[in-house]
């Protein structure tokens, strides 16, 4: 393959074993169009917090308010949907927390916590004190609207007490909920007053009502389930990576590109180069050199390591990632200092991703 290639066909075929470059299923926050949404960045000890949406830096505007660890979106629209991240920059490191925002007419917010704490919900009464059913832990029932990504597990809980001990049954959309109503059925854990549905699908959407009753009375509580369907997306690159770097002549440096993609991504590290003293070809396109790409002979493609650098290595390094949906790229600059100057890590991060325009 030529070491100099024009922009037009830099897409190489990935040969590496199939991998998922992705985060575990992020939490989903749901708002209806026109509503306001407030999210708190769930990271500790954050000196500075920066926010991104779909890998692009998010700044304050007339609808987006950033105050400390809080992000507020006023008058949400479907265009606000996407993968958000907050990055906490500390003196020694940085950490990123991801979450999804889904602005839709369907309501939602997922809950699949483990049943590690249900035993205390099973209240035993003094046999003389006859009592109609009552809720023992209303905090666990406050969130009525649940939106869960397809294929996730859903759990609804109705912790109750009473004497004699009440029974619990479940309705879906006001009718008896039978095992045959869904593929794979469902589990009821009476000890924990819970209904569990695994691997939810769109047909699971609806209202789920727990009816808790004994001979002295009956109470009920309704949850609304929305199943949020995923759709494939082009690669998302973590904001701020690769980061600008500087080193002395003869030093070593690493650029890191963090990729999130459901579909197999193809990663390329590209540098602008000169050919015959020119940076651009006769067609006006820049000369590009592919330094590294994902493939069978390439170790961790998300990292570009440069050893024993020279002044000629200074310049812009581009991390370009493509999948069958689309592509994304971000770049960083390497500054090579004369030997006597000490290197430092630079702060402000990405150059424009539109480097090919």
């Amino acid at each position: 393959r030529p070491s100099f290639s024009l922009v037009e066909d830099t897409t190489l075929e990935p040969e590496e074993p199939p991998t998922k470059y992705q985060i575990s299923q992020p939490e989903v926050y749901v708002a209806a169009p026109g509503e306001s949404l407030e999210v708190r960045c769930l990271l500790k000890d954050a000196a500075v917090i920066s926010w991104t949406k779909d890998g692009v830096h998010l700044g304050p505007n007339n609808r987006t308010v950033l105050i400390g660890e809080y992000l507020q979106i006023k008058g949400a629209t479907p265009r606000d949907s996407g993968l958000y991240a907050c990055t906490a920059s500390r003196t020694v490191d940085s950490e990123t927390w991801y979450f999804m925002v889904n602005v839709t007419d369907a309501i939602s917010s997922g809950d699949d916590e483990d049943d590690t704490d249900g035993a205390e919900d099973f209240v035993s009464e003094n046999s003389n004190n006859k009592r109609a059913p009552y809720w023992t832990n209303t905090e666990k029932m406050e969130k009525r609207l649940h939106a869960v990504p397809a294929a996730n597990t859903v759990k609804f809980r109705c912790p109750a007490g009473g004497n004699p001990m009440p029974t619990m049954r479940w309705l879906k959309n006001g009718k008896e909920f039978k095992q045959e109503h869904r593929i794979g059925g469902y589990k009821v854990r009476n000890q924990h007053w819970s209904l569990i549905m695994e691997s939810v699908v769109p047909s699971d959407k609806g209202n789920y009502t727990c009816v808790v009753e004994n001979e002295y009375g009956s109470i009920n509580h309704t949850y609304h389930l929305d199943v949020v369907e995923r759709s494939p997306h082009r690669p998302i690159l973590q904001a701020g990576l690769p980061a600008n770097a500087s080193t002395v002549v003869g030093g070593d440096v690493e650029f890191v590109c963090k990729v999130y993609s459901d579909a197999q991504p193809h990663i390329q590290w590209i540098k602008h180069v000169e050919k015959n003293g020119s940076k651009y070809g006769p067609d006006g396109l820049p000369y590009l050199k592919v330094l590294k790409h994902s493939g069978i002979n390439s170790s961790n493609a998300e990292v570009l390591a440069l050893f024993n650098v020279t002044e000629a290595d200074a310049g812009e390094y581009i991390c370009k990632v493509s999948n069958y949906i689309g592509q994304a790229n971000q770049s960083a600059w390497l500054t090579v200092l004369p030997k006597q100057q000490a290197p430092g890590r630079e702060k402000e991060i990405t150059a424009s991703p539109d480097y090919l325009e």
């Epitope: 897409t11 074993p17 998922k20 759709s231 197999q264 069958y324 090919l356």
Partner: antibody, heavy 114, light 107 residues
């Protein structure tokens, strides 16, 4: 809603060239690949190549590299495929599809005949 | 190039039945497989991506499964409107290749 509108059927002579279009609407044209796929009764569905409209990056199936040229016009949200040195073997239905192959055009029927 | 093989060219089923269309990749493609439905005279329609994720609006009787080299599209409770050709495709590596198709016929 997302739509891909392809140009009409073409009847051309062997040796000629043809340029078909695929006009996208209902989404941000520049951030999704446009794929081109051909369908023949004998060969089924074959991927020809893709273009990323934002920067013009292309990737071709080696089989079609000398046959097809993919371009895109961001201002009109239109992708184009030019096919050259046509023979009767190129007679087929040609589809464009958006990035994840989630939306397809209605197809352009190409007939190469003398 | 990765070869996608749909060994059954034709499958016959009855309304209400459960049917499984299979597809085999010539090498490990992880879960980078999609399924398409094509009715006579129409463009292909995307059903499943990443082996098991249904596109929005696709009836939940269509289920995709598998990883590595073996993949299955299952239709539980076949409807008359499911009469069509079904194609698998790998989106792991260019050139993105399709299976030869399976024609589903309703008895």
């Amino acid at each position: 809603q997302v739509q891909l509108q392809q140009s009409g059927a073409e009847l051309v002579k062997p040796g000629a060239s043809v340029k078909m279009s695929c006009k996208a609407s209902g989404y941000t044209f520049t951030i999704y690949n446009i794929h081109w796929v051909r369908q023949t009764p004998g060969q089924g569905l074959e991927w020809i190549g893709l273009i990323y409209p934002d920067n013009g990056d292309t990737s071709y199936n080696q089989k079609f590299k000398a046959k097809a040229t993919l371009t895109a016009d961001k201002s009109s949200s239109t992708a184009y495929m030019q096919l050259s040195s046509l023979t009767s073997e190129d007679s087929a239905v040609y589809y464009c599809a958006r990035g994840g192959f989630d939306y397809w055009g209605q197809g352009t029927t190409l007939t190469v005949s003398s | 190039n990765i070869v996608m093989t749909q060994s059954q060219k034709f499958m016959s089923t009855s309304v209400g039945d459960r049917v499984s269309v299979t597809c085999k990749a010539s090498q490990n493609v992880g879960t980078n497989v999609a399924w398409y439905q094509q009715k006579p005279g129409q463009s292909p329609k995307a059903l499943i991506y990443s082996a098991s994720y249904r596109y929005s609006g696709v009836p939940d009787r269509f289920t995709g499964s598998g990883s590595g080299t073996d993949f299955t599209l299952t239709i539980s409770g076949v409807q008359a409107e499911d009469l069509a050709d079904y194609y698998c495709q790998q989106h792991y590596n260019t050139p993105y290749t399709f299976g030869g198709g399976t024609k589903l016929e309703i008895k």
